[in-house]
């Protein structure tokens, strides 16, 4: 999975922070998405999971930013192998888990 430069990763982290902090009602009406394996291909896998949420303006910028990291389609089998088989979680939890992981990557300097 492509690795964004530090500023791009920082922008994505800030957007996820905004989502979690501004959350009033259940995020995206409590929609469920596939949980993903955060150890590899996180940007494209996160996109493929979150894109299944429609009509939720709160996460559209995040969807577009993730699509900026992998703008052209990954091969068909690539995402299914990154998905945690048959496990779905709420969008709010997905965003929180993704945020924790991206902050860890940022601290470790994994953005070059």
């Amino acid at each position: 999975s492509p690795v964004p430069p530090s500023t791009a990763l920082k922008e994505l982290i800030e957007e996820l922070v905004n989502i979690t902090q501004n959350q009033k009602a259940p995020l995206c009406n409590g929609s469920m998405v596939w949980s993903i394996n955060l150890t590899a291909g996180v940007y494209c896998a996160a996109l493929e999971s979150l894109i299944n949420v429609s009509g939720c303006s709160a996460i559209e910028k995040t969807q577009r930013m993730l699509n900026g990291f992998c703008p052209h389609k990954v091969s068909a089998g690539q995402f299914s192998s990154l998905r945690v088989r048959d496990t779905k979680i709420e969008v709010a939890q997905f965003v929180k888990d993704l945020l924790v992981h991206l902050k860890k990557l940022f601290r470790e300097g994994q953005f070059n």
């Epitope: 577009r64 930013m65 900026g68 990291f69 389609k73």
Partner: antibody
Framework: EVKLVESGGGLVKPGGSLKLSCAAS????????MSWVRQTPEKRLEWVAS???????YYPDSVKGRFTISRDNARNILYLQMSSLRSEDTAMYYC????????????WGQGTTVTVSS | DIVLTQSPASLAVSLGQRATISCKAS??????????MHWYQQKPGQSPKLLIY???NLESGIPARFSGSGSRTDFTLTINPVEADDVATYYC?????????FGGGTKLEIK
């Protein structure tokens, strides 16, 4: 307001080179993928190149090895280095913010004209 | 390469009437149930503008008179009602398979 301004077009002989630039403003440049799309004199649109926010590049076979897309994230500028130019490369070249395969080319510049002729 | 065939090449519609533009792909452009087909409007002397993404999603700021539908290989852009400002050429584009390709365009005129 998103603004994309292309420059660098002109008349070049077959086999020659040209470098196009696109100055971006009004959005966080580094967070988005960018592309070049061209429009032929017959008004057909053709995707030319894309670059991800992380610097990964994508090209159709028609320009692979001849064109190179790059970005300067510090200056918010997108580039297209074109070499071994052919008459069929004659077109209006547009810079576009690419919001990815799920969202399409979200914003377009006004274009710069490239004419390849002897 | 995926070939996109638009029809008609041109059409003339009366103000207030419905305009329907078709785009047929040589193979499916669906990915995990999402249609990777987008529609653009290009007014004379201007650059293209995104109208619809993923077959049926209206881009921000685009009037609800524009709508898109379809899946797999058959897609439709509908403008209802047509206004004078809609005079333009409309293009479909697929992003399911590299190289990304565009349709040949449909020119809309007012009758």
């Amino acid at each position: 307001e998103v603004k994309l301004v292309e420059s660098g077009g002109g008349l070049v002989k077959p086999g020659g080179s040209l470098k196009l630039s696109c100055a971006a403003s009004g959005f966080t440049f580094i967070s988005y993928a960018m592309s070049w799309v061209r429009q032929t004199p017959e008004k057909r649109l053709e995707w030319v190149a894309s670059i991800s926010s992380g610097g990964n590049t994508y090209y159709p076979d028609s320009v692979k090895g001849r064109f190179t897309i790059s970005r300067d994230n510090a200056r918010n500028i997108l580039y297209l280095q074109m070499s071994s130019l052919r008459s069929e490369d004659t077109a209006m070249y547009y810079c576009a913010r690419l919001d990815g395969y799920y969202f399409g080319f979200a914003y377009w510049g006004q274009g710069t004209t490239v004419t390849v002729s002897s | 390469d995926i070939v996109l065939t638009q029809s008609p090449a041109s059409l003339a519609v009366s103000l207030g009437q419905r305009a329907t533009i078709s785009c047929k792909a040589s193979e499916s452009v669906d990915n995990y149930g999402k249609s990777l087909m987008h529609w653009y409007q290009q007014k004379p002397g201007q650059s293209p503008k995104l109208l619809i993404y993923r077959a049926s999603n209206l881009e921000s700021g685009i009037p609800a008179r524009f709508s898109g539908s379809g899946s797999r290989t058959d897609f439709t852009l509908t403008i209802n009602p047509v206004e004078a400002d809609d005079v333009a050429t409309y293009y479909c584009q697929q992003s399911n398979e590299d190289p990304w390709t565009f349709g040949g365009g449909t020119k809309l005129e007012i009758k």
